[in-house]
Amino acid sequence: QFLKEGQLAAGTCEIVTLDRDSSQPRIEERSQTARCACRKGQIAGTTRARPACVDARIIKTKQWCDMLPCLEGEGCDLLINRSGWTCTQPGGRIKTTTVS
């Protein structure tokens, strides 16, 4: 039951960093994407501010805070119309994430 090279364990995700040079000299574009191997009944989401496989019901019902998307110690609140969520740090700083 060993994983092949590049194979993800079921239920896990990894962050893939894509580097590519643009046509402009000395300018490098860097973007990140997530690769997940979710189990049946799961879908890619966000847990503790990182990509994770989460219960598909959470996405279906748009109960985003049930993914536990915020870091420990932060407060999670749904945006109006459940269009995303906010993470509020103890100091009051708010990070907003919208779901398209």
Partner: antibody, heavy 120, light 107 residues
């Protein structure tokens, strides 16, 4: 640090409803999942179910028709109701915090447990 | 439901010994496997999650391994406080299921 404390009656009559509450102190109930587990005398652990911050739940199918787990975020508490109890429901009942360690959900903080006896 | 089977059910050992407890899942659970320790009259304590990651504060004499269906918990150089009952638990599906437990006592 986070501490959990179960409370509720230690004796319940057959056919009645077992009701327990777990009070969470030292942390916010909204940042984790929360679980109930039981252990009959001299036996192993049985997972009852867990609850999400929104109040959404997952239950053990073997108990699903009789169990309700609810959360009161304003009181930092979550509760277990088990209806139509019989002697086989006699057990130590534990509440626990479910921590998402990356992708590996594990119960990392437990209450000390409360013994519930079902007897007339 | 996924069935979790532990072996042996009981084990006698001495302080300083090295022991291994096995846990087998009825179907593949990747590395979604946790280990707990329980002493009489106390609540279980998380030792290892994700099959091999040691929980904070747990001594390094405890280690876990395996993936798929076969897992193990090893304790090197047993200490008096290690004599307890150990449970594996899968976290890959609903319901979460525990093994029946392995009772470790002093020889």
């Amino acid at each position: 640090q986070v501490q959990l404390q179960e409370s509720g009656p230690g004796l319940v009559k057959p056919s009645e409803t077992l009701s327990l509450t777990c009070t969470v102190s030292g942390g916010s109930i909204s940042s984790y999942y929360w679980s109930w587990i039981r252990q009959p005398p001299g036996k192993g652990l049985e997972w009852i179910g867990y609850i999400y911050p929104s109040g959404s739940t997952n239950y053990n199918p073997s108990l699903k028709s009789r169990v309700t787990i609810s959360v009161d975020t304003s009181k930092n508490q979550f509760s277990l109701n088990l209806k139509s109890v019989t002697a086989v429901d006699t057990a130590v009942y534990y509440c626990a915090r479910v921590n998402p360690f990356g992708y590996y959900y594990a119960m990392d903080v437990w209450g000390q447990g409360t013994t519930v006896t079902v007897s007339s | 439901d996924i069935q979790m089977t532990q072996s042996p059910s009981s084990l006698s050992a001495s302080v300083g010994d090295r022991i291994t407890i096995s846990c087998r899942a009825s179907q593949s659970i990747s590395t979604s496997l946790n280990w707990y320790q329980q002493t009489p009259g106390k609540a279980p304590r998380l030792l290892i999650y994700g099959a091999s990651t040691l929980q904070s504060g747990v001594p390094s004499r405890f280690s876990g391994g395996g993936s798929g269906t076969d897992f193990s918990l090893t304790i090197t150089s047993l200490q008096p406080e290690d004599f307890a009952t150990y449970y594996c638990q899968e976290s890959a599906s609903i319901p979460r299921t525990f093994g029946q437990g392995t009772k470790l006592d002093i020889k």
